[in-house]
Amino acid sequence: ARNGDHCPLGPGRCCRLHTVRASLEDLGWADWVLSPREVQVTMCIGACPSQFRAANMHAQIKTSLHRLKPDTVPAPCCVPASYNPMVLIQKTDTGVSLQTYDDLLAKDCHCI
Amino acid sequence: ARNGDHCPLGPGRCCRLHTVRASLEDLGWADWVLSPREVQVTMCIGACPSQFRAANMHAQIKTSLHRLKPDTVPAPCCVPASYNPMVLIQKTDTGVSLQTYDDLLAKDCHCI
């Protein structure tokens, strides 16, 4: 269940997809990746207020219990709901290979 | 990839399964659930320090970028890796039904 997409905190403040530009050095990949030199990393960032993009029943429970016991139970967290694949040209023992990674770039986001 | 399970912050401080006792009232379920009256809710709580239980490549990227840009990129978050099913006896228009929910109780946790 994807609950409300209206952010009560104001535009762009709630859980959504952001793009962060990162170099191979930033990512700690310079020793094993040749290309790309820079990645447009898509990730899920933002607050998860009550029922905003609740991924499932567990997220709804978490919201309820966070309201009751905020020091014990954290609010739901903004995480990827799915991913976009990406290829890397990576060094191997013998040269290079083109490798596909399915879990690298967030495609869309939800709260859990 | 499940990375290190050693918590550098001290025992029990990092992402792991916790049990929180909650009543139907706590959960906001009193008007549609008859049983159980109380649920042992298992949920994922705790910090996600560098590479601790990293769910995938995305989590590893997030760790690297959080270290570089802590104000922009949040640390990975402790969320369910899988769920245990649970049945609820719930009210219906005509009486009651026994309904299974697959996404209600966390089974184990990882950082993402």
Epitope: L34, S35, P36, Q40, N84, P85, M86, V87, L88, I89, V96, L98, T100, L104, L105 | -
Partner: antibody, heavy 118, light 107 residues
């Protein structure tokens, strides 16, 4: 496994538009870093890069041919199309499409011969 | 556009010999040079990436080196299946450009 197949008319008249399609399998053009390129080879001559299109729809063209070229993709059909307008005999060549991962062209189709003649 | 000048345009050699092909770029391309093999009636096969990195599955008798403007491709011990045309290509900037090719023939 990765496969690419070029298809085209075989024979085109001078001044007409050449339309080629590359149909591929084994990879997706929605994958970050993936592209499809076109390369041609006139009979008995060397290779000439024509154009390529990326996963994000960015397009790059051979400088000399740019004004005559159109490239497009249909990600759902796993196809890339190339159009070359106002053809002359100098455009007679075997046309190849190739999968690209950034600046690697690692898999090529078997090529399709296009002859420009009236 | 960057011009890639390959030499020689052809060479004759025997099985077991060492073969060296050179490629010169008209401007600095760092290490962004690839090498391809093409047999008659076939499509090119990708061999070397970024001057010196062998692609997956390419035998280690094939090697490359160089940076800036001068690049070398070597077959350490030519095998019967290696007789073909070899092309260099710069992948430093678009438009990507190829060398004219070197035909490796049996002596």
């Amino acid at each position: 496994q990765v496969q690419l197949q070029e298809s085209g008319p075989g024979l085109v008249k001078p001044s007409e538009t050449l339309s080629l399609t590359c149909t591929f399998s084994g990879f997706s053009l929605s994958t970050y870093g993936i592209g499809v390129g076109w390369i041609r080879q006139p009979p008995g001559k060397g290779l000439e890069w024509i154009a390529h299109i990326w996963w994000n729809n960015n397009k790059y063209f051979n400088t000399a041919l740019k004004s005559r070229l159109t490239i497009s993709k249909d990600t759902s059909k796993n196809q890339v199309s190339l159009k070359l307008s106002s053809v002359t005999a100098a455009d007679t060549a075997v046309y190849y499409c190739a999968r690209m991962g950034y600046d690697i062209m690692d898999y090529w189709g078997q090529g399709t011969l296009v002859t420009v003649s009236s | 556009d960057i011009v890639m000048t390959q030499s020689p345009s052809s060479l004759s050699t025997s099985v077991g010999d060492r073969v060296t092909i050179t490629c010169k770029a008209s401007q600095d391309v760092n290490t962004a040079v690839a090498w391809y093999q093409q047999k008659p009636g076939k499509s090119p096969k990708f061999l070397i990436y970024s001057s010196s990195y062998r692609y997956t599955g390419v035998p280690d008798r094939f090697s490359g080196s160089g940076s800036g403007t001068d690049f070398t491709f070597t077959i350490s011990s030519v095998q019967p299946e290696d007789f073909a045309v070899y092309y260099c290509q710069q992948h430093y900037s678009t438009p990507w450009t190829f060398g004219g090719g070197t035909k490796v023939e049996i002596k």
